[in-house]
Amino acid sequence: QEDEDGDYEELVLALRSEEDGLAEAPEHGTTATFHRCAKDPWRLPGTYVVVLKEETHLSQSERTARRLQAQAARRGYLTKILHVFHGLLPGFLVKMSGDLLELALKLPHVDYIEEDSSVFAQSIPWNLERITPPRYRADEYQPPDGGSLVEVYLLDTSIQSDHREIEGRVMVTDFENVPEEDGTRFHRQASKCDSHGTHLAGVVSGRDAGVAKGASMRSLRVLNCQGKGTVSGTLIGLEFIRKSQLVQPVGPLVVLLPLAGGYSRVLNAACQRLARAGVVLVTAAGNFRDDACLYSPASAPEVITVGATNAQDQPVTLGTLGTNFGRCVDLFAPGEDIIGASSDCSTCFVSQSGTSQAAAHVAGIAAMMLSAEPELTLAELRQRLIHFSAKDVINEAWFPEDQRVLTPNLVAALPPSTHGAGWQLFCRTVWSAHSGPTRMATAVARCAPDEELLSCSSFSRSGKRRGERMEAQGGKLVCRAHNAFGGEGVYAIARCCLLPQANCSVHTAPPAEASMGTRVHCHQQGHVLTGCSSHWEVEDLGTHKPPVLRPRGQPNQCVGHREASIHASCCHAPGLECKVKEHGIPAPQEQVTVACEEGWTLTGCSALPGTSHVLGAYAVDNTCVVRSRDVSTTGSTSEGAVTAVAICCRSRHLAQASQELQ
């Protein structure tokens, strides 16, 4: 960070005349908001990112910045515009007193303002290196395609690009945006400055210890010699990548962000924009043994967020901390004692640990997948990464109890063949944030733009919930779960699938008057049932049990409690076929599961009956899990009987298309 006092001589004293002719008033009814890092030591007061509304042009951004300077000058404050953003997000970076925030928030076009904050390299010990030779035989790993069609951007420290392991593979761009190192006695030693970035470049594309040996890389320096950077520097780096992409479009791009800071709305927004421009972003979940949703860019939904596991597939412990976890993590990857290029010498290797190393593994796998199938979208790539991961190998006891259900039990792996997965119907489970405990609280889970929401379920640890429903929001279906009075809150769980040319709709049946329960089916020609949801207004559904097995010849039907409205997700897509699979247990049981067989993909997961002792239902890979209250707290055994209902689908169309390609 620039010396707070030292450069005030340089600050532009804006002229009052700048104000003339800039009398655009802020739009009525819209209040700009101020955000800052929740972690106090990471805050950088005095520097602010002013984010303008989406359609703001560069000229308007510049004019708004000048207007701020002019109004500040009238009040006797000096300001300095450090950067004007365009290409990714409209806005500007300004050095000013916090006293001016109120004024800045009232400027025209302003959407929100965020105080700058620190981001950090996510490796431990990233500068206490241990020189070691590679501990494997090079023959063992000869990937079919080394990622040669893909360019991987690395936003990190400086790197020793002529290290034997990566020479010729990494182009060092002229981009550099780093804060001053802390401490007056800091000694800048080149090999230490390059340590983190060199190691990660080696993990991604190193000749002997790299994942994607054919991938070419470009490095941007956003972390200083202590492994520290800023949100604003990272934003400007992401903007640089977007501009480079526009100037010289190349093949698929992967951006590796092996860094983390506190939750940042603006950093997440920039990642979203870049992802929507077709760039794959991979980031470290963070090394704080905490919920990854509290950190950025880990919490950005469009980013592939990677936690770290060790050689035994256990979550990595890093001193007193360890890998982050939770619903914002997409998958885990090796992140302990990872051998890679050491900047201590041109032939040295070192082992480093952390979610940075894990993210570098996934960036390498992504580069190989994209090189084999350059047309893959971000959604398709993410689904493939999940599909080919090792399932259920992580010991979940390491995670806090309330995070276990939310954290994906997936360890990244290379596909057995980088081609030929096209026939598969890919689905993943997306958990919402927790709703909070208020009576009317709801939680919403969303799929990515090019995924289809095929089913929606809900879960509450207390069991006090009012079900869930699929509803349209901004032209897209979302999954909304409802808390109940006295409940501690709910989660919405969306099943998000890749289903090309799909036409899906929701059919709803209101609560039934009759005692037989509520039913709804897919009545449109060619539409099949992909998921069932139920939602009720009453606080307790009671013990009414609808018939568990649906009548023969009516597989396209959702059945539920008579006091609940039932929602059927009905889809039409070429060659799509689905079937209902049920597993009922007569005696009370805390967990009932039912899985789809090989070749079929779980699209829907729900529970019968929807009574209050059922905590909820959710999909884990291809298994539908229904959780009930602790058996000891369940009154009668008759109420304890629970059925897990899975809807399993496959696409004959995708299978045929794949065979035709081969």
Partner: antibody, heavy 115, light 109 residues
């Protein structure tokens, strides 16, 4: 295009010193170091060492350690190799090559050490 | 004594295929993906023909191919042509340096 251009032939007396230059062009210098390789008449290739164009770090072959110094001048994109205390068995063609991968070679500098 | 062992000479007729071997240890050829092959005509600098075991630089004929098994790397030239007559050297990384083979003289009969 990528090019490495070396200095001209040299005749030296035993005990003298030799300094060969290699000027690089056509690529991003910091992405590769420079290797030095020599070839005695009718013999094979011998790797002598490597220097980083990025930070000046060196990696010398054990056989020549202490007698060889490699340096770089980034302002002129030129790398130098100095050999001290020349002996008759230092008679060889000296090549510079790009990086450890040695994908591009200089034209060679013939060095004769003779009394 | 070179660190990597190559046959001193091989020969073949035009159109034939020949293979040159390069044997090292687990500390060089067997331990790294970075085996290279160079062609050298008399009075000329070496030219890179194969890098990282089996990759061909652009501009090198696809008649040249490389492979590796254990501690031995091989260069195969198919459809021999008169201009292939030259010396061929293999090289490999070691933990801290580079080593070359002694060279193989290829004669096209």
């Amino acid at each position: 295009q990528v090019q490495l251009v070396q200095s001209g032939a040299e005749v030296k007396k035993p005990g003298a010193s030799l300094k060969v230059s290699c000027k690089a062009s056509g690529y991003s210098l910091t992405s590769y170091g420079i290797s030095w390789v020599r070839q005695a008449p009718g013999q094979g290739l011998e790797w002598m060492g490597w220097i980083s164009a990025y930070n000046g770090n060196t990696n010398y072959a054990q056989k020549v350690q202490g007698r060889v110094t490699m340096t770089t001048d980034t302002s002129t994109s030129t790398v130098y190799m100095e050999v001290r205390s020349l002996r008759s068995d230092d008679t060889a063609v000296y090549y510079c090559a790009r990086g450890y991968g040695m994908d591009v070679w200089g034209q060679g500098t013939t060095v004769t050490v003779s009394s | 004594q070179s660190a990597l062992t190559q046959p001193a000479s091989v020969s073949g007729s035009p159109g034939q295929s020949i293979t040159i071997s390069c044997t090292g240890t687990s500390s060089d050829v067997g331990g790294y993906n970075s085996v290279s092959w160079y062609q050298q005509h008399p009075g000329k600098p070496p030219k890179l023909m194969i890098y990282e075991v089996s990759n061909r630089p652009s501009g090198v004929s696809n008649r040249f191919s490389g492979s590796k098994s254990g501690n031995t790397a091989s260069l195969t030239i198919s459809g021999l042509q008169a201009e292939d007559e030259a010396d061929y050297f293999c090289s490999s990384y070691t933990s801290t340096s580079m080593v070359f083979g002694g060279g193989t003289k290829l004669t096209v009969l």
